[in-house]
Interface confidence: low
């Protein structure tokens, strides 16, 4: 394979156009670049993008800090998928988005002591091991170095989910929650993106083991309520994105928790707020709080007579409870 350039960070070397099939038992030479990849030693970057790779290249150069494996056909990430001798000690950012992963096994990211950012977005993750981020030894929950975990649009198609649609969604949410709360592994996580996953609710303990979280993105899901979520322990949380969900109202417990977070900014645009008597506490809170960004843009969706009314402009006389909700907006 050709040498990686060191003169320009934007210059990449491509390896020979064939897919190596043998597993190399030796550490790669410093200038080696895997087949079907582009490498820049100066930028400490390897890009194996849109090459239909079916497994992670074995001969990744030891200098790699940024690894892009997007747009491939990896299907499964086994334990130790990135384990090398010596370890890829510099690898800090790993992007696996859009690589048709449907299974991530326990210990898939072991032996990556510097891994700070991981992007698994746009993969139909039907099987995400509870130990995917915490190591393959079930008896051990050593801390992960991960700081940013990007899991946008990882929900598998409906026909790949267990037990049909509603039960399948509950199972999916539970599977994701189990991976996030595994031991104490993700206690250093500061950014978590879970947008566009059709979440109907937040499992009660989804966030329980993520005390360092600063940024949480839950936009474009199907969240109807935050009743079971607890943000109380997320004392470092700075940004909570809840745009484009199905939220009808935020209840007192949630309002108090959010108000109690010292650095929080909450984003609530494009939710179908139901402006009836249950909305009174939230409207009062909105008028007083500084934590909601763009609160003047929040408008009612139901009942019909209140549609497009600005929440901040409502008073208690506007908020009555005579309408019957359409079935699609009723919750148990």
């Amino acid at each position: 394979s050709s040498s990686s350039p060191t003169s320009s960070a934007s210059s990449f070397s491509s390896s020979a156009p064939f897919l190596a099939s043998a597993v190399s038992a030796q550490p790669p030479l410093p200038d080696q670049c895997p087949a079907l990849c582009e490498c820049s030693e100066a930028a400490r970057t390897v890009k194996c993008v849109n090459r239909n790779l079916t497994e992670v290249p074995t001969d990744l150069p030891a200098y790699v800090r940024n690894l892009f494996l997007t747009g491939n056909q990896l299907a499964v990430l086994p334990a130790g998928a990135f384990a090398r001798r010596p370890p890829l000690a510099e690898l800090a950012a790993l992007n696996l988005s859009g690589s048709r992963l449907d299974e991530v096994r326990a210990g898939a990211f072991e032996h990556l002591p510097s891994l700070r950012q991981l992007d698994l977005s746009h993969n139909p993750l039907a099987d995400l091991s509870p130990f995917a981020f915490s190591g393959s030894n079930a008896s051990v929950s050593a801390p992960s170095p991960l700081e940013e975990l990007i899991l946008n649009h990882i929900v598998p198609p409906e026909d790949q989910r267990q037990n049909g649609s509603f039960e399948g969604m509950v199972a999916f949410e539970g599977m994701v929650a189990a991976a996030l709360r595994s031991g104490l592994a993700l206690r250093g996580l500061t950014r978590l993106e879970l947008a566009s996953n059709h979440f109907l609710f937040l499992p009660r303990d989804l966030l329980a083991q993520l005390p360092s979280l600063r940024y949480l993105d839950l936009r474009n899901n199907s969240l109807v309520s935050l009743t079971y979520a607890s943000f109380r322990n997320l004392t470092h949380l700075e940004s909570l994105h809840l745009e484009d969900n199905a939220l009808k109202v935020l209840h007192n417990g949630t309002l108090a928790e959010l108000q109690g977070l010292p650095h929080i900014r909450v984003f609530l645009d494009n939710n179908p707020w139901v402006c009836d008597c249950h909305m009174a506490d939230m409207v009062t809170w909105l008028k007083e709080t500084e934590v909601v960004q763009g609160k003047d843009r929040l408008t009612c969706a139901y009942p019909e007579k209140m549609r497009n009314r600005v929440l901040l402009e409502l008073n208690s006389a506007d908020l009555d409870c005579d309408p019957i909700l359409p079935p699609s907006l009723q919750t148990s």
Partner: antibody, heavy 117, light 108 residues
């Protein structure tokens, strides 16, 4: 519970080859690394190599490369080590062990290899 | 390769005595990847301490581990008869993976 069951003791002649096995049970075979470790009588431990059955990635100690061959059969959840060109120096107990960078959690009971004419 | 030197090679300790075994690496080892095993005659090694200071399942609390860089140690706060065994340190940091030669701990 996790178990690693190793094959019976072997008595072989110098220059011959031997293939020993390590059958795993109680966990998902493809999720964990299997390492092989040598221990001569009254001596310390020496790492031979390791295999990830999930991706079939294999790493060898250079000292054993070329004489040790590690394989895994996913269908039977069994790892194998073949040693060739045997000498009396190869007489030892050989352990398989399961685990990762946080230590080898589980060990087989060992296979005793005796190389003698 | 990283050479792990254990000292002493053999040590005798009385019941109740505080015992410290040391492991020195020829070059720096990531503390996450430094482990200790206990082995008794005729048995397989057992993971005893992982990632420098974490006790494996079932290991008595009188054991502890510490260290960083090239210097690591295993300590028993109060020696008991069942602690007599050989202890090996092990690095899972660089290939080839290596073990120390072991410290044989005997009951005085």
């Amino acid at each position: 519970q996790v178990q690693l069951q190793q094959s019976r003791p072997e008595l072989v002649k110098p220059g011959a080859s031997v293939k020993m096995s390590c059958k795993a049970s109680g966990y998902t075979f493809t999720d964990y690394v299997i390492s092989w470790v040598k221990q001569r009588t009254g001596q310390g431990l020496e790492w031979i190599g390791e295999i990830y059955p999930g991706s079939n990635s294999i790493y060898y100690n250079e000292k054993f490369k070329g004489r040790a061959t590690l394989t895994a059969d996913k269908s039977s959840s069994t790892a194998y080590m073949q040693l060739s060109s045997l000498t009396s120096e190869d007489s030892a107990v050989y352990f398989c062990a399961m685990g990762g960078n946080y230590g080898f959690d589980y060990w087989g009971q060992g296979t005793t290899l005796t190389v003698s004419s | 390769q990283i050479v792990l030197t254990q000292s002493p090679a053999i040590m005798s300790a009385s019941l109740g005595e505080r015992v410290t075994l040391t492991c020195t690496a020829s070059s720096s080892v990531n503390s996450n990847y430094l482990h200790w095993y206990q082995q008794k005659p005729g048995s397989s090694p057992k993971l005893w301490i992982y990632s420098t200071s974490n006790l494996a399942s079932g290991v008595p609390a009188r054991f502890s581990g510490s260290g960083s860089g090239t210097s690591y140690s295993l300590t028993i706060s109060s020696m008991e008869a069942e602690d007599a065994a050989t202890y090996y340190c092990h690095q899972y940091h660089r290939s080839p993976l290596t073990f120390g030669a072991g410290t044989k701990l005997e009951l005085k």
